[in-house]
């Protein structure tokens, strides 16, 4: 079998074959394609069960998508010498169900990490911080993509999935430099209270396609750099005054609220007033009442206070079964 040496510009990607010799520093691992010119290694859809040990030192972009990795242990990418150039790591759709503490240690340049489409039954609190110290060394991560990482119901741990993800995001305050966080399609019922306070550099936050019913206990106040907040396709019924004021106070933000089942009753009055004067909400004239029945399909922006009533609550003596 011929072994693949470092790729040349004439052959941007070379697939490696098994080699009898010990790996050279810039050799391409078996079942991978490598381009030194592009500083890229692709080990895609190869049913790999572990991270290749013989990754070339030049790798800046590493794609390990569509594999069967199952577990990412501590130091999964630790090498001697370290993979000092690795900046973008894509592990999406690789059947990971466990990411252990310190899995991404010894990657000093890692700016972008994508773990999407892995059913993570266990995500260590120290997956991104690397240590259990109350304040860790800052992570170099700038973009963290965690879309659709919720495991099936039968694989969930006893603790809440929201809590498990939150613990990993806040541990050691390691992610203070994070600019982008994607948490779409994770069946989140709520956003743990303290998460956003620990992510002050966020510019882009995607919480779309979850099951968020309320933002009452979520504070956006310190996200002064936030530019995009995606809340579409949730179960939001109304935004209350505290949330409205916080969003209005963010200097650069654009908020996306499509496809939430807004309840157009007396509790909606403040939100309607705010919508009419804010420039924060994108496509605000698409927001449409879902409930109550008499209000269904009405455009929120066209409502006035007279439309927004609540059925009187009968005193217990007048209630009938």
């Amino acid at each position: 079998t011929s072994s693949a040496s470092s790729s040349s510009s004439s052959a941007p990607f070379l697939a490696s074959a098994a080699s009898a010799q010990p790996p050279l520093p810039d050799q391409c691992p078996a079942l991978c394609e490598c381009s030194e010119a592009a500083r890229t290694v692709k080990c895609v859809n190869r049913n790999l069960t572990e991270v290749p040990t013989d990754l070339p030192l030049y790798v800046r972009n590493l794609f390990l998508t569509g594999n069967q990795l199952a577990v990412l242990p501590a130091g999964a990418f630790a090498r001697r010498p370290p993979l000092a150039e690795l900046a973008a790591l894509n592990l999406s759709g690789s059947r990971l169900d466990e990411v252990r503490g310190g899995a991404f240690e010894h990657l000093p340049s890692l700016r972008q990490l994508d773990l999407s489409h892995n059913p993570l039954a266990y995500l260590s609190p120290f997956a991104f911080s690397g240590s259990n110290a109350s304040i860790s060394a800052p992570s170099p991560l700038v973009e963290l993509i965690l879309n659709h990482i919720v495991p099936p119901d039968d694989k969930r741990q006893n603790r809440s999935f929201e809590g498990m993800v939150a613990a990993a995001l806040v541990a050691g305050r390691a992610l203070q430099g994070l600019h982008l966080l994607e948490l779409a399609s994770n069946h989140f019922l709520y956003l743990p209270r303290d998460v956003l306070a620990q992510l002050p550099s966020l510019r882009y936050l995607d919480l779309s396609n979850n099951s968020l019913v309320s933002l009452t206990y979520v504070s956006f106040r310190n996200l002064t750099h936030l530019e995009s907040l995606h809340l579409e396709d949730n179960a939001l019924k109304v935004l209350h005054n505290g949330t409205l004021a916080e969003l209005q106070g963010l200097p650069h933000v654009r908020v996306f609220l499509d496809n939430n089942p807004w309840v157009c009753d007396c509790h909606m009055a403040d939100m309607v007033t705010w919508l009419k004067q804010t420039g924060v909400v994108q496509g605000k004239d698409r927001l449409t009442c879902a409930f109550p029945e008499k209000m269904r399909n009405r455009v929120l922006l066209e409502l006035n206070s007279a439309d927004l009533d609540c059925d009187p609550i009968l005193p217990p003596s007048l209630q009938t079964s």
Epitope: R286, V299, L303
Partner: antibody
Amino acid sequence: QVQLQQPGTELVKPGASVKLSCKASGYTFTSYWMHWVKQRPEQGLEWIGNINPSNGNTNYNENFKSQATLTVDKSSSTAYMQLSSLTSEDSAVYYCARGGWDFDYWGQGTTLTVSS
Amino acid sequence: QVVLTQSPAIMSASPGEKVTMTCSASSSVRYIHWYQQRSGTSPKRWIYDTSKLTSGVPVRFSGSGSGTSYSLTISSMEAEDAATYYCQQWTSKPPWTFGGGTKLEIR
């Protein structure tokens, strides 16, 4: 009661344009988006686009972007759809429908025939 | 864009028979709406938010499902139920899409 009134038929020549109308009554016209849907003979339903009567904002199905133009006249509570450069493929029934999450009221449809 | 696939395309049922038709989504959707269109008439919203019957729809109709799999059931077929039924995904932003329809005939 909510009603959406559409003319029954329109006959036009290939290459010409036509402006279909939909007159709304029984509700506040500006409070609901108005949608247009195409149905060719013995075929399914195809969403063309919608318009917010309050501000004139529109959305279009990519397949109709270059051919359909949606407008409204608030004073008469009427929505319009202009179709240009007509061919025989455009012969169909065109419905207006009030909607948001779903289409809760439909017009009776205008049968457009494109023939020389 | 979500693609909705209805099956069967055509079916027939005898009076009194139980009827079930399905609507399969290419990716998960929160709810599905169903429309009934009798021959020569405009569609009518029949079932909305997966399982709620529009006012005036007989209680022999029901809807169920979640995720990517939805169905409309008639507990006991009647002649007036002969029509084409279309599903549509729950959304308030473009594009709106319909399934290809299931034509239900009386045997």
